[in-house]
Interface confidence: low
């Protein structure tokens, strides 16, 4: 007899129990499933998703969830009109509570929230809310994705039809239709105050099976501002028993959440069962790998005007502001080259896609630091001229940031190009992602016995005879005792760190979306004649989780569009909705060879010595290579390795100067995990330690890119 209610798995004596509300009182019973117990399951390991089917046959069905939604294949369904929400604008009562179930954090809704429309067969009542998240710093945690792009958090609201059933549990146990909404949370520079009661609640349910009443919140405020654009498909529960009874409504637009607020999710603990031994671990990566669509059709809503803006507007500007009305994709092929000791030349190519032609001109914006002040200049260049600009009177000890924006009619703008960094008189280059917080041992659990939290440390790693001094800075682990290169997280040259004012101690993390209010000067950096060029880009890849059992496309950036409400997207990458086929067309068009083609997953990665990587002239790269074109994220799912929508295949040499530390403490770090140098072939089975944030750069391979974006001051409107 099935007593299992998938929604509230709670680990009790080795079994997953079901929360059943006692309708005659406020008590909640946890039914312990023993002799007739529902099967234990987990998100990884021996009881992980690939094994769910052995105890829950439906998990092997053909209509499973979650899925990747490819926008271009979604059909507009005329029956999918406006959602009618009832009660969503009311403040929740003080009886609404949150529980750490061990598999998720669930909110038990005690008030009447109803939804109808959207093709739902009747008026459905909201029962509960559940969350799915990644492991740190905005890494991919959503279950669903759009065009391969996953998000840091997915909130799911579950509904049942009270006209048909007296409770949600009955609907589940009867294998009847239920409804579910999926809402993505995207990283934003600022806290989302609507989430405060939820975040506060999370702090009260840190440990498994903890419960807490929630401060009043407005459920509507947890939904996207615009509800008109959504996808619809039929699928399943995303946890055992995976019943294929769910009518999914997946909102296209995300809800903002700050890094600080994300930390509350990453701080939740669970209890895991390993060979009859229970261990307390962080609850992270609590998402099911994506499932095949099979014969299903994904529909999209037919709400008038809801899909007017190109998908880029939400991928890059989740808050859906005026800045989202872009007229083209970004200018590409950004380059900065020194002409002489005091002049630089910036060049670019026209955008690949122009939504609202023609391009009238280009705005070149550059900023630098001088005497502790940040300065910025902007000038225009007609589109019919050479796509180059010369910057004269370059100061030798300033860090310059360049970006270009196309301007169309009616002062419509493109997205910003990659931001290029140029620093004269420096030979050492910081390569890798943003600096992340150190000295927080509790921020990540050890994921295996040979891992332990670190605060900071330094070491030296050598590949092909080239020494790299690095500083360990991570919310995660130090190198594993196995010595695997795959667990090294940020390769940073200590000289440049010192020059930027960083010592060996804890370093503030810096969110990807805020330009430093004061750009770092390089006064104390080593003074040598080489002039490296550093490119950053806003489009970052979210790592897929370790242990994803199906090759889903989650290499797409969870961080695109983490913009301040009024800021333009500065993503230099192509994040429009190209699926694999479109990507490959673009590859052929631009003549770019992707890493996936260049280096088969099972072939060794050559690592030739490259002594003159940053030779005189600054923009020269490895001999025999015209340019380092591609930054490719490690495909954590073992799936595709091409540069997907979140990565620009036309990226130039892409190393990055770390943002300066500021008074503000941010909890973010870049989720991107680029290719690791390795003496052995990178096999499909190789994965990186889940919480590792160390990045090493193989000079012979692709560089990594990070992200810098602009705060309100000096914004180019």
């Amino acid at each position: 007899v099935l007593h299992y209610v998938v929604c509230f798995p709670a680990l009790t004596e080795g079994y997953v129990g079901a929360l059943h509300e006692n309708r005659h009182g406020s008590a909640v019973q946890i039914r312990r499933r023993k002799a007739s117990g529902d099967p234990y399951w987990a998100y990884s390991g021996a009881y992980g998703p690939e094994h769910w089917v052995t105890s829950s046959v439906s998990c092997g069905g053909r209509h499973q969830s979650p899925i990747d939604i490819l926008d271009q294949y979604a059909r507009v369904g005329e029956e999918y009109q406006e959602l009618q929400l009832d009660g969503f604008d009311n403040e929740s009562s003080n009886k609404t509570w949150m529980k750490n179930t061990g598999k998720t954090v669930a909110i038990l809704l005690k008030d009447d929230y109803f939804v109808s429309g959207a093709g739902l067969p009747g008026r459905f009542k909201a029962e509960k809310v559940e969350f799915h998240w990644g492991h740190s710093n905005g890494s991919a945690g959503s279950e669903h994705s759009i065009n391969g792009r996953r998000f840091p958090v997915e909130m799911q609201i579950f509904f049942y039809n009270p006209d048909d059933f007296d409770s949600f549990q009955t609907a589940i146990s009867e294998n009847r239709i239920i409804g579910a909404m999926a809402i993505f949370f995207q990283v934003s520079p600022r806290d989302n105050s609507a989430l405060d009661p939820i975040i506060h609640g999370l702090k009260g349910v840190v440990h498994h099976e903890k419960e807490t009443f929630l401060d009043p919140f407005v459920l509507r405020d947890l939904l996207p501002a615009s509800l008109g654009s959504y996808y619809r498909y039929t699928g399943s529960l995303t946890t055992p028993p995976c019943s294929e009874i769910v009518e999914w409504i997946v909102f296209r637009r995300p809800v903002p959440i700050s890094y600080h607020q994300l930390e509350a999710f990453y701080s939740i603990f669970t209890t895991e069962q390993q060979d009859h031994v229970k261990s307390v671990e962080y609850l992270r990566n609590n998402f099911r790998p994506q499932q095949r669509l099979h014969d299903r059709v994904v529909s999209k809503s037919a709400v008038r005007d809801s899909w007017n803006h190109d998908m880029t507007d939400f991928l890059e500007n989740p808050l859906g502001t005026e800045a989202s009305k872009v007229c083209s994709s970004p200018p590409i092929h950004m380059k900065v080259q020194p002409l002489n000791q005091t002049a630089l030349q910036v060049s670019w190519s026209q955008p690949e896609t122009i939504y609202h032609p023609p391009i009238m001109n280009y705005m070149i914006s550059y900023s630098w630091t001088k005497n502790e002040d940040e300065k910025e200049k902007t000038f225009t260049k007609d589109s019919d001229k050479d796509l180059k600009a010369t910057i004269s009177h370059v100061s030798p000890d300033s860090l310059y940031l360049f970006r270009v924006q196309a301007v169309c009619r009616n002062d419509m703008r493109s997205d910003f190009s990659q931001t290029m960094l140029f620093q004269a008189n420096t030979t050492r280059i910081f390569q890798g992602t943003r600096i992340v917080k150190t000295g927080v041992p509790t921020a990540s659990p050890a994921s295996s016995a040979d891992m332990a939290p670190i605060s900071s440390g330094s070491s030296t790693w050598t590949s092909s005879g080239i020494p790299f001094s690095f500083v360990s800075m991570a919310t995660g682990m130090g190198p594993s005792s196995s010595g695997s290169q795959a667990t090294v997280a940020s390769v940073v040259t200590s000289t440049l760190l010192a020059g930027l004012g960083f010592g060996g101690g804890g370093i503030s993390s810096f969110p990807s979306t805020v330009w430093p209010t004061r750009l770092p000067t390089a006064a104390s950096a080593s003074k040598q004649a080489a002039r490296p060029v550093l490119a950053t880009t806003e489009a970052l890849a979210s790592p897929g989780p370790d242990g994803d059992s199906s090759p889903t496309k989650d290499g797409e950036g969870t961080e695109e569009g983490e913009k301040d409400e009024k800021s333009e997207s500065e993503d230099g990458e192509r994040e429009h909705e190209e699926d694999g086929e479109k990507d490959s067309e673009k590859k052929e068009k631009s003549g770019v060879t992707h890493a996936a083609e260049e280096r088969n997953q099972t072939e060794p990665s050559p690592t030739p010595s490259s002594p003159n990587r940053t030779a005189e002239g600054g923009h020269q790269t490895i001999p025999g290579h015209e340019q380092d074109h591609t930054a490719v994220p490690t495909d954590q799912t073992g799936g595709r390795r091409d540069a997907g929508p979140g990565l620009d295949p036309d990226m130039v040499t892409s190393t990055q100067v770390p943002p300066t530390a500021t008074e503000e403490q941010y909890a973010g770090s870049d989720p991107k995990r680029p290719e690791m140098p390795s003496k052995k072939p990178m096999s499909r089975g190789d994965r990186f330690s889940e919480d590792s944030r160390f990045i090493t750069v193989n000079p012979a391979e692709k560089n990594t890119s990070g992200m810098i974006s602009r705060p309100a001051p000096g914004r180019m409107e």
């Epitope: 007899v1 099935l2 007593h3 829950s56 046959v57 439906s58 209509h63 067969p121 009747g122 009270p162 006209d163 048909d164 059933f165 007296d166 009955t170 146990s173 009867e174 294998n175 009847r176 239709i177 239920i178 039929t234 028993p241 294929e244 009874i245 059709v297």
Partner: antibody, heavy 115, light 111 residues
Framework: AQSLEEFGGRLATPGTPLTLTCTAS????????MSWVRQAPGKGLEWIGT?????DAYYASWAKGRFTISRTSTTVDLKMTSLATEDTATYFC???????????WGPGTLVTISS | SFVLTQPASVQVNLGQTVSLTCTAD??????ASWYQQKPGQAPVLLIY???SRPSGVPDRFSGSSSGNTATLTISGAQAGDEADYYC?????????????FGGGTQLTVTG
């Protein structure tokens, strides 16, 4: 392969109680709602009732009181009382899946009520 | 009570496309499923939730729903498609949950 089979169909006189039993192979009965559907000779399909995973049963209005569905972990039973000639039909045991759909049907067992 | 109405019989030429309908007052709020039954056999599920097809069902069979009418479409009708076709849906609330079958449509394939 997943399948169902019904047992207990036979010739009976009006008023005689009769119990039909359904067993499954290839899947666990306990995970699904199970239903009984009947079809009189030359007529259409007629839903009798459904029993959920937790044992709660739902019946067609005409079947209430005369038909009772029960289940164990391995069987689903249909207990019929006060049978009349118009209850002559092939009785199908059916698995309900996908929400509101009958995806696996047994071959049926014939119940004939005749005096 | 809730009644599903189907045409008693429909004819189609071999290789042609035929649509079988199922109507009810509030069908727009319900999911329809479709079943094929050949003489002497148990019914087989063809379509569930209006449009979804179980694995093993040929893609010649498709379902749709508009307003209070659910439709089963058979494209390229074959002799083996000659059978009775039933639609079904659910109705009711709470403990009065009901499942209802239509009267069935006998499909004849000619030629």
């Amino acid at each position: 392969a997943q399948s169902l089979e019904e047992f207990g169909g036979r010739l009976a006189t009006p008023g005689t109680p009769l119990t039909l039993t359904c067993t499954a192979s290839g899947f666990s009965l306990g995970t699904y709602s199970m239903s009984w559907v009947r079809q009189a000779p030359g007529k259409g399909l007629e839903w009798i009732g459904t029993i959920g995973g937790r044992g709660d049963a739902y019946y067609a209005s005409w079947a209430k009181g005369r038909f009772t569905i029960s289940r164990t972990s391995t069987t689903v039973d249909l207990k019929m009382t006060s049978l009349a000639t118009e209850d002559t039909a092939t009785y199908f045991c059916v698995r309900e899946n996908y929400g509101y759909a009958f995806d696996i049907w047994g071959p049926g067992t014939l119940v004939t009520i005749s005096s | 009570s809730f009644v599903l109405t189907q045409p008693a019989s429909v004819q189609v030429n071999l290789g042609q496309t035929v649509s079988l309908t199922c109507t009810a007052d509030t069908l727009s709020r319900r999911y329809a499923s479709w079943y094929q039954q050949k003489p002497g056999q148990a019914p087989v599920l063809l379509i569930y939730r209006d449009t979804s097809r179980p694995s093993g069902v040929p893609d010649r069979f498709s379902g749709s729903s508009s307003g209070n009418t659910a439709t089963l479409t058979i494209s390229g009708a074959q002799a083996g498609d000659e059978a009775d076709y039933y639609c079904a849906t659910s109705d009711g609330s709470g403990s009065s949950y009901q499942c209802v079958f239509g009267g069935g449509t006998q499909l004849t394939v000619t030629g």
